[in-house]
């Protein structure tokens, strides 16, 4: 079952998943000036069996130069700047998807992909929060949110994270504090570790990832 809402928004923080539960869908979105090919898939789907999960369908973008791309015909109500519905992930693939059964790893980028990724999460999905650059994490508890089903409705748990405006940033669970940080790389926050099995597995996964996984656009 798809989660009804998006994960909660935390001021001055972004979220990402370390792995995606089977059933998760990813929109095939193209960058400006390109569009999905007519016969192409609308979504990629994380699918699999007990031993192997992978993304079904392929996203393909083609130039829309021959088409009129100015399609706004009436003003949007209370016009707003476009926001990243779900944080874009970097194309790094350091973790074997089989390390978390029933989950897919981040799909590789496709040509002319949009600079944001829009996911449709399923019940049981966990996402992790990190303060944006220039903000420091104050933890009251785990900086994570899980989509849960209660009384036939889905809800995301509230991450216990406050981002305060200091020139330091937090990291994903399991990331080690660097010996020296000439580029001002984020410090580790160990207080966000909890003891659920799922989280431990994903913490181990997170430990193998570099801070660049929070890049919102491909270089």
């Amino acid at each position: 079952e798809l989660c009804d809402d998006d994960p909660p928004e935390i001021p001055h923080a972004t979220f990402k998943a370390m792995a995606y539960k089977e059933g998760t869908m990813l929109n095939c979105e193209c960058k400006r000036g390109f569009r999905r090919i007519k016969s192409g898939s609308l979504y990629m789907l994380c699918t699999g069996n007990s031993s192997h999960s992978s993304w079904d369908n392929q996203c393909q973008c083609t130039s829309s130069a021959t088409r009129n791309t100015t399609k706004q015909v009436t003003p949007q109500p209370e016009e707003q700047k476009e926001r990243k519905t779900t944080e874009m992930q970097s194309p790094m693939q350091p973790v074997d998807q089989a390390s978390l059964p029933g989950h897919c790893r981040e799909p590789p980028p496709w040509e002319n992909e949009a600079t944001e990724r829009i996911y449709h999460f399923v019940v049981g999905q966990m996402v992790y929060y990190q303060c944006v650059q220039g903000y420091r994490a104050l933890h009251r508890g785990p900086a994570e949110s899980v989509c849960k089903m209660t009384h036939g409705k889905t809800r995301w748990t509230q991450p216990q994270l406050i981002c305060t405006g200091e020139m330091e940033t937090s990291q994903f669970p399991g990331e080690e504090k660097p010996q020296a940080s000439p580029e001002g790389r984020p410090e580790s926050e160990t207080s966000c570790l909890v003891t659920t099995t799922d989280f431990q597995i994903q913490t181990e996964m997170a430990a193998t990832m570099e801070t660049s996984i929070f890049t919102t656009e491909y270089q």
Epitope: D5, D6, C28, L42
Partner: nanobody, 126 residues
Amino acid sequence: QVQLVESGGGLVETGGSLRLSCAASGITFNDHTMAWFRQAPGKEREFVAARDWSDIITRYASSVKGRFTISRDNAGNTGFLQMNSLRPEDTAVYYCAAREGGVVAGVRSGAPYDYWGQGTQVTVSS
């Protein structure tokens, strides 16, 4: 010229029902995702429901799930929002929107939608 025209709004008592329609011209609904948003006075625009033309994904805001149903008649190029068990907090201007890509849902997800109607007022009295 693309046009989305909403109709079916009005004044209804708490617990009542309304069926909103969205008639499209200039685009074909059978290759567009269709969505409904709403905006109450002094509040941000809010996602209500969306459904792609392939019926792969249908999403609802948790506040309306189980009460509202989004449907579409691709042949007639019309979308619908059936609203049951209406509450005073459902009072808003309801907008129909469409896009060529897949469903985009969420709190402030309107930006990716390409086409918008002018809105229809729904008022639920207590």
